[in-house]
Interface confidence: medium
């Protein structure tokens, strides 16, 4: 029987790719990462690898924006010898590369002592909340390089002195990788430097903000005007950032719990929440603020902050168990994160091998449940949804690229927290 390949394709960031197709991934906040090549393999897996650049034999090699590797000037196509940085357009105004400006209305949970600082870098707009220092004068003045007003004479306190300058140095890797994650409270020690471990992280349910932040702390969101004009959605007078979810508030009906809207770039996408047909109890009950009925009983009471029902649904989405195993030997740490699925009945295991903080090896393996049960050292850590797993794998793609070239200490641990669903904000979905 002839094997048909036509049905096999790869899904990567909501795009379908044909077998054999190659592309550069689009990773925020970098944009198109020309130094990574992805290919759709025959078995439907996406394989991404870093481009290895050859040594160039000239004194001043030139970097070209859409090419990964530096070239010698004489090997360049003559037309493109001049490399010009792209300007940005935001809200009808054009900003030059490197220019700083102030934006309004981007962050719905902005504190009174915070302002929104934006910067234009290579055609992309990067915006963040800047916590301003307390003012000790009656007539503060504006300065060109900050959205915060300062007292006359304090003008020297520019970005260079703030914690984690993500605008002056857009190549600061620590500050520039980003993925969505659930809201969780990082341990206080993580905040010591004023910058949380993932300053680029945006909650998909609300901005990850600490109102007690040190002066200059930035939580970054990304607006890439070429592809996405001002990554925010406005619904019912409220502003939502890319990735945020909410239940629509309709004048005639109030909050519609059985519809979940998500801000996708600038477009809101709403979908009906499907409740399970069968419940594991005889009389499931309707609870205010929840779309689906839940089974009453001990379990629900024991988990006050959770939006699970007993069948393992979270906000109407089916949940799956996540297991973890951490194994250390000879200075090498092997961390495995496993997701057990029902359809198909298998376990997807993500294996990370890290030595001295540098990622040595990363691969994904799909194995049968029976084989998985036989593996030692795995502990059930949480249950998660497919949408959270997708966020996790996208973040994983970014940090696997990043951690193979520089030391990563807690990036993977922090990323795993994306999978935890326990604290749904304000107890609703």
């Amino acid at each position: 029987e002839q094997v048909k390949h036509s049905e096999t394709y790869c899904m990567f960031q909501d795009k379908k790719y044909r077998v054999g197709e190659r592309w550069h991934p689009y990773l925020e906040p970098y944009g198109l990462v020309y130094c990574v090549n992805c290919i759709c393999s025959e078995n439907g897996n996406v394989l991404c690898s870093r481009v290895r650049c050859p040594n160039v034999h000239c004194l001043s090699p030139v970097h070209i924006p859409h090419l990964c590797c530096p070239r010698c000037p004489d090997s360049l196509p003559p037309v493109n010898n001049k490399v010009t940085s792209k300007s940005c357009e935001y809200n009808g105004t054009t900003y030059q590369h490197g220019e700083l400006f102030v934006a309004e209305g981007l962050f719905q949970n902005r504190q009174p002592n915070q302002c929104t600082q934006c910067s234009c870098s290579e055609g992309n707009v990067y915006c963040g909340l800047k916590t301003c220092p307390k003012l000790t004068c009656a007539f503060p003045v504006s300065v060109p390089d900050s959205c915060c007003r300062v007292c006359r004479g304090d003008g020297e306190l520019s970005w260079e002195h703030s914690d984690g300058d993500i605008f002056r140095q857009p190549a600061n890797r620590e500050a520039r990788h980003s993925y969505h994650r659930s809201h969780y409270d990082p341990p206080p020690s993580r905040q010591a430097g004023g910058l949380s471990r993932f300053p680029g992280a945006r909650s998909h349910r609300g901005a990850l903000m600490d109102s007690q932040q040190a002066s200059g702390t930035i939580v970054q969101i990304v607006i890439n005007n070429k592809h996405k004009h001002g990554q925010v959605c406005v619904s019912n007078g409220k502003t939502y950032s890319h990735g945020e979810s909410w239940h629509p508030n309709l004048r005639a009906f109030g909050i519609v719990e059985c519809v979940l809207c998500t801000c996708n770039v600038t477009k809101q996408e709403c979908k009906k929440i499907h409740c399970p047909n069968r419940y594991p109890c005889k009389y499931p009950q309707k609870i205010d603020g929840k779309c689906c009925k839940v089974c009453p009983g001990k379990k629900a009471k024991e988990l006050p902050g959770q939006s699970f029902d007993n069948k393992g649904y979270f906000c109407g989405e089916e949940t799956m168990p996540v297991y973890e195993s951490v194994f250390m030997e000879d200075g090498e740490t092997t961390r495995k994160i496993a997701l057990e699925t029902e359809r198909p009945p298998q376990v997807e295991v993500h294996v990370w091998t890290i030595r001295k903080g540098i990622l040595q090896h990363f691969h994904i393996e799909k194995i049968s449940k029976r084989m998985f049960e036989e593996l030692p050292h795995f502990k059930l850590v949480t249950r998660t949804t497919l949408s959270q797993w997708k966020i996790f794998t996208e973040g994983e793609a970014q940090i696997s690229q990043m951690c193979s070239s520089r030391v990563c200490r807690t990036e993977l641990e922090d990323l795993v927290k994306v999978l935890y669903l326990e604290r749904s904000e304000k107890g609703h979905c």
Epitope: E42, G44, T334, H363, E365, P376
Partner: antibody
Framework: EVQLQQSGPELVKPGDSVKISCKAS????????MNWVMQSHGKSLEWIGR????????FYNQKFKGKATLTVDKSSSTVHMELRSLTSEDSAVYYC?????????????WGQGTTLTVSS | DIQMTQSPASLAASVGETVTITCRTS??????LAWYQQKQGKSPQLLIY???SLEDGVPSRFSGSGSGTQYSMKINSMQPEDTATYFC?????????FGSGTKLEIK
Amino acid sequence: EVQLQQSGPELVKPGDSVKISCKASGYSFTGYFMNWVMQSHGKSLEWIGRINPYNGDTFYNQKFKGKATLTVDKSSSTVHMELRSLTSEDSAVYYCAKGAGALRNYFDHWGQGTTLTVSS
Amino acid sequence: DIQMTQSPASLAASVGETVTITCRTSENIYYSLAWYQQKQGKSPQLLIYNANSLEDGVPSRFSGSGSGTQYSMKINSMQPEDTATYFCKQAYDVPFTFGSGTKLEIK
């Protein structure tokens, strides 16, 4: 270079037991499963079981439970397989084979094989 | 246990000819399939894993494909040194099981 050195050929009588060994070198011994595979004369291959050298955990093919016992000696990076209550059916070449990595259940390096002959 | 049906049992090919060996499994193994080559009097050697990934050092004339329960291995241009017995093996579930083998000879 990864090497799996197996012990020499064995000629034993029916009902006896035999212990064959596989000494590993050239890689982190405790980081990879060690598998054992049987190949009867001119026949296909049969997976006997595997051992995790890190902690001695074993998993056997049901067919070989009670027949084979896998053990590990970490100090010498050696895995042993004991076969008991031998019959002529057990005459075969036995291979040890290293697993290809964390959860990759492919055998990327094989020993040279140990020929076992059970005959009275 | 997962059953492996490998075909043909044997075949002879001329140098430069394309050879295809197939393997059918009794249930979906989600690409967890390997192909091994065993030359006369030697140990088996891993050629292909994950149904289509070529092991380091294996000539590019070898390739694997397939999905679900149907898999195949192709030798693009048969060479004299490819004379061997080839086995498929599923690595999806324990116990791991092998195909019965395909003996490939040169014409």
